[in-house]
């Protein structure tokens, strides 16, 4: 029986040209995490992190994707095209597969600064 739950950073926004950390966390299960896959909004793979073999980054993203922190992924030099859904897929033993979703909105620098300036503390 799958008892675990995936917690994610949820909906996040970041500045164009900046960077953002995508994080998922699996809790409430003793299952062994054998691999975490990170997928983009078009369901293409960005990276794989195997528990023994480590990180394997898709070549097209090598310059813009940094592994970590932890099982997370850091996206750098953000463009407007990076806006969309991201998925973390946890492959575990013996539970099976858990999946989390993050929505990233990339904002034009001026818009991001403007919205940040008028946030209620």
């Amino acid at each position: 029986m799958m008892t675990g739950t995936i917690e994610t950073t949820g909906n996040i926004s970041a500045k164009k040209g900046g960077s953002v950390i995508l994080q998922c966390h699996l809790s409430s299960t003793m299952a062994q995490v054998t691999q975490v896959n990170w997928e983009q909004h078009d369901h293409s793979l960005l990276a794989i992190r195997n528990a023994e073999l480590g990180w394997h980054i898709y070549p097209a993203f090598k310059d813009r994707v940094a592994p970590g922190p932890g099982l997370g992924l850091t996206l750098q030099s953000l463009t407007m095209n990076d806006t969309g859904e991201y998925f973390c897929t946890y492959h575990t033993y013996p539970d099976g597969t858990y999946r989390g979703r993050i929505f990233l909105e990339v904002l034009e620098s001026s818009v991001a600064e403007h919205s940040a300036r008028f946030q209620i503390p």
Epitope: T34, Q35, N37, E39, H43, S44, L45, I48, N50, A51, E52, L53, G54, H56, Y58, P59, H91, Y93, T97
Partner: antibody, heavy 114, light 107 residues
Framework: EVQLVESGGGLVQPGGSLKLSCAAS????????MSWVRQTPDKRLELVAT????????NLPDSVKGRFTISRDNAKNTLHLQMSSLKSEDTAMYYC???????WGQGTSVTVSS | DIVMTQSHKFMSTSVGDRVSITCKAS??????VAWYQQKPGQSPKLLIY???TRHTGVPDRFTGSRSLTDHTLTISSVQAEDLALYYC?????????FGGGTKLELK
């Protein structure tokens, strides 16, 4: 040049044990996860063990779990596969493989037969 | 476990021919597919990873492609030295699994 040289194979009786070794050179061994992949007489490939770069985590399929142990000695650039309670179906060529399978050794042959 | 099926155990070809070796995954493995070549008496060698990226030193006559769960290794103009066993492998999910192999031989 990346080199992986396996040794330790041979003929062993069912229920017996064998320890395979792999000497690595030409790369920073301690930076890579490593695996053992076997090729059965009918040419099928099966991943039988993987180990993290620092040796802190291992993974073995159910077919060999409890019978095989993978280990490494980063000081000596060596990978090991301890095999016990061997069965006839373990007969295969065993390859030492680097990382995401980018370099393979020449293999060492294991025959389990009475 | 994900099953990788190479339906052709043998494929006959001639030097200069274009040949496509196929592999079907039992579920979507995205682009997490590699292809290996094994010549007689040798160990397997990585040709393609991430479905379409050639490994160092691999001639550009080898290309990999994907259409949903169907994965294909194409040799644009077969050379005599290409006669070998070819395997696909998925690394989308553990345990990583290999296809049964396709032997490329001369007609």
């Amino acid at each position: 040049e990346v080199q992986l040289v396996e040794s330790g194979g041979g003929l062993v009786q069912p229920g017996g044990s064998l320890k395979l070794s792999c000497a690595a050179s030409g790369f920073t061994f301690s930076s890579y996860g490593m695996s053992w992949v076997r090729q059965t007489p009918d040419k099928r490939l099966e991943l039988v063990a993987t180990i993290k770069s620092d040796g802190g985590s291992t993974n073995l399929p159910d077919s060999v779990k409890g019978r095989f142990t993978i280990s490494r000695d980063n000081a000596k650039n060596t990978l090991h596969l301890q095999m016990s309670s061997l069965k006839s179906e373990d007969t295969a060529m065993y390859y030492c493989v680097r990382g995401y399978f980018d370099y393979w050794g020449q293999g060492t042959s294991v025959t389990v037969s009475s | 476990d994900i099953v990788m099926t190479q339906s052709h155990k043998f494929m006959s070809t001639s030097v200069g021919d274009r040949v496509s070796i196929t592999c079907k995954a039992s579920q979507d493995v995205k682009t997490a597919v590699a292809w290996y070549q094994q010549k007689p008496g040798q160990s397997p060698k990585l040709l393609i990873y991430w479905s379409s990226t050639r490994h160092t030193g691999v001639p550009d006559r080898f290309t990999g492609s994907r259409s949903l769960t169907d994965h294909t290794l194409t040799i644009s103009s077969v050379q005599a030295e290409d006669l070998a066993l070819y395997y696909c492998q998925q690394y989308y999910s553990t345990p990583y699994t290999f296809g049964g192999g396709t032997k490329l031989e001369l007609k």
